[in-house]
């Protein structure tokens, strides 16, 4: 669960009164003020480990739409445009929090859920190359 | 806010009775069952655009600890270990949901917040601006 700051008057997480269900305000506060508006915009295409973005939609989840990256090549793209198979494209994955409607279709009751998403791809040296 | 499935008996999001505050169960369900256990483990070090991971801690947020990637180089690392400045290491960023205690220190009241995090780095061809 969530670690609660130790304030007097706050039951600790071992306490039977510790809240397993909390109130959450859905008016999302967006902290991304000073970020580069371009962000990862066209990196998916310009990367040496380019990726495609696939739309994953689930109306029982918030956010309902998540974009999943899928690397385009097993190798990495060289300056001449050919694939270098001595290098490997791999997905960079991150665990994110989503809200899952529980019970299903219920508008005001959710459960926190962790899911693993691929955000983009990076080019790595393979662990092993040749056999003696 | 969150788009609600149109079920009979569910007020729509224009309705004044639409819930802006919902109940969320904090017993996290983890969906990462069939994912590759290796995940991004040592990619940060083996990448041609390697990155360091910085711990960002905030007790008023859940998750309280978020790891931020910072690219190690402006350029990308070549096979010989030298940096190629004709290429650029760039962070792959993703918007994620977190829960922010509101009011502060309150254990059972939160607000959804979107924050932008850098998950890792990728090597891209630079956008070249030629001078006429």
């Amino acid at each position: 669960g969530i670690a609660i700051p130790r304030n007097s008057g706050c039951p600790n997480s071992e306490d039977k009164n510790f809240p397993r269900t909390v109130m959450v305000n859905l008016n999302i506060h967006n902290r991304n003020t000073s970020t580069n508006p371009k962000r990862s915009s066209d990196y998916y295409n310009r990367s040496t480990s380019p990726w495609n973005l696939h739309r994953n939609e689930d109306p029982e989840r918030y956010p309902s739409v998540i974009w999943e990256a899928k690397c385009r090549h097993l190798g990495c793209v060289k300056a001449d445009g050919n694939v270098d198979y001595h290098m490997n494209s791999v997905p960079i994955q991150q665990e994110i929090l989503v809200l899952r409607r529980e019970p299903r279709h219920c508008p005001n009751s959710f459960r926190l859920e962790k899911i693993l998403v691929s955000v983009g791809c990076t080019c790595v040296t393979p662990i092993v190359h040749h056999v003696a | 806010g969150i788009a609600i499935p149109r079920n009979s008996g569910c007020p729509n999001s224009e309705d004044k009775n639409f819930p802006r505050t919902v109940m969320v169960n904090l017993n996290i369900h983890n969906r990462n069952t069939s994912t590759n256990p290796k995940r991004s483990s040592d990619y940060y070090n083996r990448s041609t655009s390697p990155w360091n991971l910085h711990r960002n801690e905030d007790p008023e947020r859940y998750p309280s600890v978020i790891w931020e990637a910072k690219c190690r180089h402006l350029g990308c690392v070549k096979a010989d270990g030298n940096v190629d400045y004709h290429m650029n290491s760039v962070p792959i960023q993703q918007e994620i949901l977190v829960l922010r205690r509101e009011p502060r220190h309150c254990p059972n009241s939160f607000r959804l917040e979107k924050i932008l995090v850098s998950v890792g780095c990728t090597c891209v061809t630079p956008i070249v601006h030629h001078v006429a």
Epitope: L74, Y85, N88, I127 | Y43
Partner: antibody
Framework: QVQLQQPGAELVMPGASVRLSCKAS????????IHWVKQRPGQGLEWIGE????????NYSPKFKGKATLTVDKSSSTAYMQLTGLTSEDSAVYFC?????????????WGQGTTLTVSS | DVVMTQTPLSLPVSLGDQVSISCRSS???????????LHWYLQKPGQSPKLLIY???NRFSGVPDRFSGSGSGTDFTLKISRVEADDLGVYFC????????FGGGTKLEIK
């Protein structure tokens, strides 16, 4: 069902060029790579190259760079391979095949092949 | 290029036999994403290759369960538990983690 249709045979003169076709049906053309593979009589299979129909990205085996050029026509879901400077060494059966991307990167469906004969 | 070596070149069998075909690669076929890209095809005379097994051990749709694949690193095996007449032809292994290459083929024929 997934089908890759290729003409049965082509006869061309030495030194000439030829364009082989591969018409895809039964799936979304732009979601899969198209590969080309050469097979000489009684011999093994040689990979020539691949093209991504979604953006026409091509990747060639070093051996066939300069010999083969891969293109697609999205409107007709057809892939093409142009072979130039033909010699008797180019006489072979040429297969097109499709593959998925990344985790699904293997040729799962193949055309019946075009027999190319280079002869005067 | 990665060299794929198949043994034997020719495999005379009787119907109902269990047979194994070996494929060895000159380089390890494990990708950094954890997958091993070694596949098996069957080519019958006058036809195109048909996918049997992908990524070492996964049977392609419609392939009977008498076909199985195993192995890791550089050594791989295709097993047919009970050979049927429809199984005769040339078997190829291939790898797609490097520039794609194919083995030389193993001809399965009746004794």
């Amino acid at each position: 069902q997934v089908q890759l249709q290729q003409p049965g045979a082509e006869l061309v003169m030495p030194g000439a060029s030829v364009r082989l076709s591969c018409k895809a049906s039964g799936y979304t053309f732009t979601n899969y790579w198209i590969h080309w593979v050469k097979q000489r009589p009684g011999q093994g299979l040689e990979w020539i190259g691949e093209i991504d129909p979604s953006d026409t990205f091509t990747n060639y085996s070093p051996k066939f760079k300069g010999k083969a050029t891969l293109t697609v026509d999205k409107s007709s879901s057809t892939a093409y391979m142009q072979l130039t400077g033909l010699t008797s060494e180019d006489s072979a059966v040429y297969f097109c095949a499709r593959s998925g991307i990344y985790y699904d990167y293997y040729e799962d469906y193949w055309g019946q092949g075009t027999t190319l004969t280079v002869s005067s | 290029d990665v060299v794929m070596t198949q043994t034997p070149l020719s495999l005379p069998v009787s119907l109902g036999d269990q047979v194994s075909i070996s494929c060895r690669s000159s380089q390890i076929l494990l990708h950094s994403n954890g997958n091993t890209y070694l596949h098996w095809y069957l080519q019958k005379p006058g036809q195109s290759p048909k996918l049997l097994i992908y990524k070492v051990s996964n049977r392609f749709s419609g392939v009977p369960d008498r076909f199985s694949g195993s192995g890791s690193g550089t050594d791989f095996t295709l097993k047919i538990s009970r050979v049927e007449a429809d199984d005769l032809g040339v078997y190829f292994c291939s790898q797609s983690v490097h520039v794609p290459t194919f083995g030389g083929g193993t001809k399965l024929e009746i004794k």
